[in-house]
C-alpha cells in the first residue's frame, strides 16, 4: 500500500499556503483529487508529488494515491482543508442526477472542519427542506439526501454558521429521475368492435407511466391517426388518453387498430379489430351434432353459440314435442358471454326421462330478426323382450317381440333342460334373425321388432330363448314347453 506524506488523515492550511503531498510506493504511483487550480504534479520514480504554492478554498478535498500494479488495489488518502474565512464551501458539482431511492450526494465540501457543528442544508432562497427529507453530512464529502424522491428535485444550498451569520454555498441542482420499470402500460378499449355502417363508434387508447416523457399514438392499419390527447396525473402516474370518435362509420374505418406507447425503455403495443357491417346480423351455431342420441337416465347439455350485433333483445329454449307439453325449466338454461358479440347458451337436461325425448329449439331475436336452432334428441333404451307360442297357418310358432332403441337384433337359442337363460354348455342350436319384422318405428320412440321361430315339435325337456341386443344392452325371454302346455317367463332380474 502506498504512503502519503505528511502521514496525517487531515491537513488544515490557510489560503496562499504552500502544500506538498508526496505519495511513496514500491512501484509507480498515481494520485487523484478534486479538479482544482494551481497544482503541479511530477514524478521521480517510485514517488509522485502534488504541490501548490498558493492554496485556495478550491483545493479543499480528498487526495488519494494508488499503485496501479498492486493486485490488492490498495490506496492511501489525505483530506486537505483550505480554511478561507470568506469561503466556507467548495462545491465540486452544480448538478447532481440520481434515480429515485438512490442516495444523492450534494458535493459541498467544508473548507474548515471547525464549522461542522453549524452546517445545514436548505433550498435556494432560504426555503426549508421538504418534509421527510432524510439527510446526513460529511465534512469530507458534503450532504447526502438518503433515498431521494422525485419531488426532491430542487435547487439546494449548503449553509454554514460563520461569526453568527449563515454563509451559503453556490446552488446545487438535484435532479431525481423516476425509475422507469419498462415501456408505458397500455389499454385499448373495446377489445373488439362491430358497428353497422352509419352508426357511431368510439375507440380509446390510453397509456400511463411514472415518467412524463413517453409518446402514445393510435394506428389504423398502418396509418398513425391524428387524435388530440387528454393528459392527466394521478396515483403518481402520468396518463395520456387518445379517443377516436367516429360519428358515422363506413367500411373504410374497419380493420386493425393498434395502440402504441414508447419511452426510453422501449415500446408496447396492443391491437383490436373493428368490423363494419352492412346490417344487423344474428348467427346461431353449435359445435354439437343437431341430432343427439342419449341413453335414458343419463344427462345432456345442449349448447348454442350466438354471434350477434346489435345485442340480443330476447332468447329462450322451447320444447317442441312430441310428448308432453312440458317446457324446459328456466333454471336449467344458462347463458355465458364469451365477449361482446359472442354468447353461449346451454340447456341442461339431467337424468333424461322417456317423455323428454323430442325437439328442443333455441330461439333468439335482435334487430336483425329471429333465428332458431333445433336439436333432435332421441333416447336410447335397452331391449325389452317377450315370447308367446301361437299357431300361424297351422304351424306352431314362437313369436318374439323386442322393443328398444336403436333397433334390436334378435337371436334364438335352443338349449337342453329347463333354464331361465341358456348358457354355452347347454346350447343345442342358434338361429340369427337378420331381418326381424319392424312393427313400429316412430321418431323419438322405441323401435319394436318381431321375430318368428317355426317349431314343428316342441321338445319338452328343452328351453327356447329369444335374445335381443343393441348398443345399449340386451334382453331375453325363455320359453319352456311343459306337458300341460307351453310356459313362458323372462329371466330372473
Amino acid at each position: 500500500i502506498p504512503v502519503i506524506e505528511p502521514s496525517v488523515p487531515e491537513l488544515v492550511v490557510k489560503p496562499g499556503a504552500t502544500v506538498t503531498l508526496r505519495c511513496v510506493g514500491n512501484g509507480s504511483v498515481e494520485g487523484d483529487g478534486p479538479p482544482s487550480p494551481h497544482w503541479t504534479l511530477y514524478s521521480d520514480g517510485s514517488s509522485s508529488i502534488l504541490s501548490t504554492n498558493n492554496a485556495t478554498f478550491q483545493n479543499t478535498g480528498t487526495y488519494r494515491c494508488t499503485e496501479p500494479g498492486d493486485p490488492l488495489g490498495g490506496s492511501a488518502a489525505i483530506h486537505l482543508y483550505v480554511k478561507d474565512p470568506a469561503r466556507p464551501w467548495n462545491v465540486l458539482a452544480q448538478e447532481v442526477v440520481v434515480f429515485e431511492d438512490q442516495d444523492a450526494l450534494l458535493p459541498c465540501l467544508l473548507t474548515d472542519p471547525v464549522l461542522e457543528a453549524g452546517v445545514s442544508l436548505v433550498r435556494v432562497r432560504g426555503r426549508p427542506l421538504m418534509r421527510h427529507t432524510n439527510y446526513s453530512f460529511s465534512p469530507w464529502h458534503g450532504f447526502t439526501i438518503h433515498r431521494a424522491k422525485f419531488i426532491q428535485s430542487q435547487d439546494y444550498q449548503c449553509s454554514a454558521l460563520m461569526g453568527g451569520r449563515k454563509v451559503m454555498s453556490i446552488s446545487i441542482r438535484l435532479k431525481v429521475q423516476k425509475v422507469i420499470p419498462g415501456p408505458p402500460a397500455l389499454t385499448l378499449v373495446p377489445a373488439e368492435l362491430v358497428r353497422i355502417r352509419g352508426e357511431a363508434a368510439q375507440i380509446v387508447c390510453s397509456a400511463s407511466s411514472v415518467d412524463v416523457n413517453f409518446d402514445v399514438f393510435l394506428q389504423h392499419n398502418n396509418t398513425k391517426l391524428a387524435i388530440p390527447q387528454q393528459s392527466d396525473f394521478h396515483n403518481n402516474r402520468y396518463q395520456k388518453v387518445l379517443t377516436l370518435n367516429l360519428d358515422q362509420v363506413d367500411f373504410q374505418h374497419a380493420g386493425n387498430y393498434s395502440c402504441v406507447a414508447s419511452n426510453v425503455q422501449g415500446k408496447h403495443s396492443t391491437s383490436m379489430f373493428f368490423r363494419v357491417v352492412e346490417s344487423a346480423y344474428l348467427n346461431l351455431s353449435s359445435e354439437q351434432n343437431l341430432i343427439q342420441e342419449v341413453t335414458v337416465g343419463e344427462g345432456l347439455n345442449l349448447k348454442v353459440m350466438v354471434e350477434a350485433y346489435p345485442g340480443l333483445q330476447g332468447f329462450n329454449w322451447t320444447y317442441l314435442g312430441p310428448f308432453s307439453d312440458h317446457q324446459p325449466e328456466p333454471k336449467l338454461a344458462n347463458a355465458t358471454t364469451k365477449d361482446t358479440y359472442r354468447h353461449t347458451f346451454t340447456l341442461s337436461l339431467p337424468r333424461l326421462k322417456p317423455s323428454e325425448a323430442g325437439r328442443y329449439s333455441f330461439l333468439a331475436r335482435n334487430p336483425g330478426g329471429w333465428r332458431a336452432l333445433t336439436f333432435e334428441l332421441t333416447l336410447r333404451y335397452p331391449p325389452e323382450v317377450s315370447v308367446i307360442w301361437t299357431f300361424i297357418n297351422g304351424s306352431g310358432t314362437l313369436l318374439c317381440a323386442a322393443s328398444g332403441y336403436p333397433q334390436p337384433n334378435v337371436t334364438w337359442l335352443q338349449c337342453s333342460g329347463h333354464t331361465d337363460r341358456c348358457d354355452e354348455a347347454q346350447v343345442l342350436q342358434v338361429w340369427d334373425d337378420p331381418y326381424p319384422e319392424v312393427l313400429s318405428q316412430e321418431p323419438f320412440h322405441k323401435v319394436t321388432v318381431q321375430s318368428l321361430l317355426t317349431v314343428e315339435t316342441l321338445e319338452h325337456n328343452q328351453t327356447y330363448e329369444c335374445r335381443a341386443h343393441n348398443s345399449v344392452g340386451s334382453g331375453s325371454w325363455a320359453f319352456i314347453p311343459i306337458s300341460a302346455g307351453a310356459h313362458t317367463h323372462p329371466p330372473d332380474e
Epitope: 412524463v212 409518446d215 388530440p228 390527447q229
Partner: antibody, heavy 123, light 107 residues
Framework: EVQLQQSGPELEKPGASVKISCKAS????????MNWVKQSNGKSLEWIGN????????TYNQKFKGKATLTVDKSSSTAYMQLKSLTSEDSAVYYC????????????????WGAGTTVTVSS | DIQMTQSSSYLSVSLGGRVTITCKAS??????LAWYQQKPGNAPRLLIS???SLETGVPSRFSGSGSGKDYTLSITSLQTEDVVTYYC?????????FGSGTKLEIK
C-alpha cells in the same frame, strides 16, 4: 398558397340553427385536422373541437358537445360546423383553424386560420 | 381542464424596448405551448410552438422560453406592428385552452 375561406356573417333568431363553412385550398385537405375556435366579442379564444377530414373522427370540448356538430365534405375540401339551439351566448366570431403538425398525436397548435365567421343571435 | 393564466391583461411598452409576456398553466404541460398574435379584426397568427420554436416567417425579435407550468414570450426591439394582443395556448391535454390574452399599449 394555403388558405381557409369561411362563409359570411349570419344573423339568427334564438332557438334556430346555423351551419357555417370553411373551404380549404392550397394543401391536402384530408391530411390535416380541422379545428374550430370561438371568440366572443374581443374576449379570449375557446377551442370547440376538431375533425379528421380523412377518417371523420371528431373530438369535442365537453362544453360544446350537443351545441356544435362538425362534419366535412371531402369532395369539396370543405369543413362545416353546425350550431343548434342558438342563444345570445352563441354570438361570437367562429374561426376554423388547421392543425399545424401533419402526423401523430402530439402537436395541436394551429398554423393556418380562416378569417372568421360572425354569428349574431338576436330576436 | 388546464387553465392558462396571462396575469397581465394590459402591458405598457416602449417602442424599441423589450417586453416579456407571461403565461402560467394550472398543471405541468411539458412545453406543449403555442403563442399567437392577434391584430384587431384579424384571425390569430401562430408565432411559436413547442414553447420555443419560432414559426417560419416570424421575426427573430420574438422568442419563447419556459418549462413545466411557467412560460414567457419575449419581444425585443419592439415595433409599432407588435403592439397588439398575444395569446398562449396549451395543447398538452384536451380541451385545448387559451390564455385570456395580453394587450400591449404604447406608454
Amino acid at each position: 398558397e394555403v388558405q381557409l375561406q369561411q362563409s359570411g356573417p349570419e344573423l339568427e333568431k334564438p332557438g334556430a340553427s346555423v351551419k357555417i363553412s370553411c373551404k380549404a385550398s392550397g394543401y391536402s385537405f384530408t391530411g390535416y385536422n380541422m379545428n374550430w375556435v370561438k371568440q366572443s366579442n374581443g374576449k379570449s379564444l375557446e377551442w370547440i373541437g376538431n375533425i379528421d377530414p380523412y377518417y371523420g373522427g371528431t373530438t369535442y370540448n365537453q362544453k360544446f358537445k350537443g351545441k356544435a356538430t362538425l362534419t366535412v365534405d371531402k369532395s369539396s375540401s370543405t369543413a362545416y360546423m353546425q350550431l343548434k339551439s342558438l342563444t345570445s351566448e352563441d354570438s361570437a366570431v367562429y374561426y376554423c383553424a388547421r392543425r399545424g403538425d401533419y402526423s401523430g398525436s402530439s402537436y395541436w397548435y394551429f398554423d393556418v386560420w380562416g378569417a372568421g365567421t360572425t354569428v349574431t343571435v338576436s330576436s | 381542464d388546464i387553465q392558462m393564466t396571462q396575469s397581465s391583461s394590459y402591458l405598457s411598452v416602449s417602442l424599441g424596448g423589450r417586453v416579456t409576456i407571461t403565461c402560467k398553466a394550472s398543471d405541468h404541460i411539458n412545453n406543449w405551448l403555442a403563442w399567437y398574435q392577434q391584430k384587431p379584426g384579424n384571425a390569430p397568427r401562430l408565432l411559436i410552438s413547442g414553447a420555443t420554436s419560432l414559426e417560419t416567417g416570424v421575426p427573430s425579435r420574438f422568442s419563447g422560453s419556459g418549462s413545466g407550468k411557467d412560460y414567457t414570450l419575449s419581444i425585443t426591439s419592439l415595433q409599432t406592428e407588435d403592439v397588439v394582443t398575444y395569446y398562449c395556448q396549451q395543447y398538452w391535454s384536451t380541451p385545448f385552452t387559451f390564455g385570456s390574452g395580453t394587450k400591449l399599449e404604447i406608454k
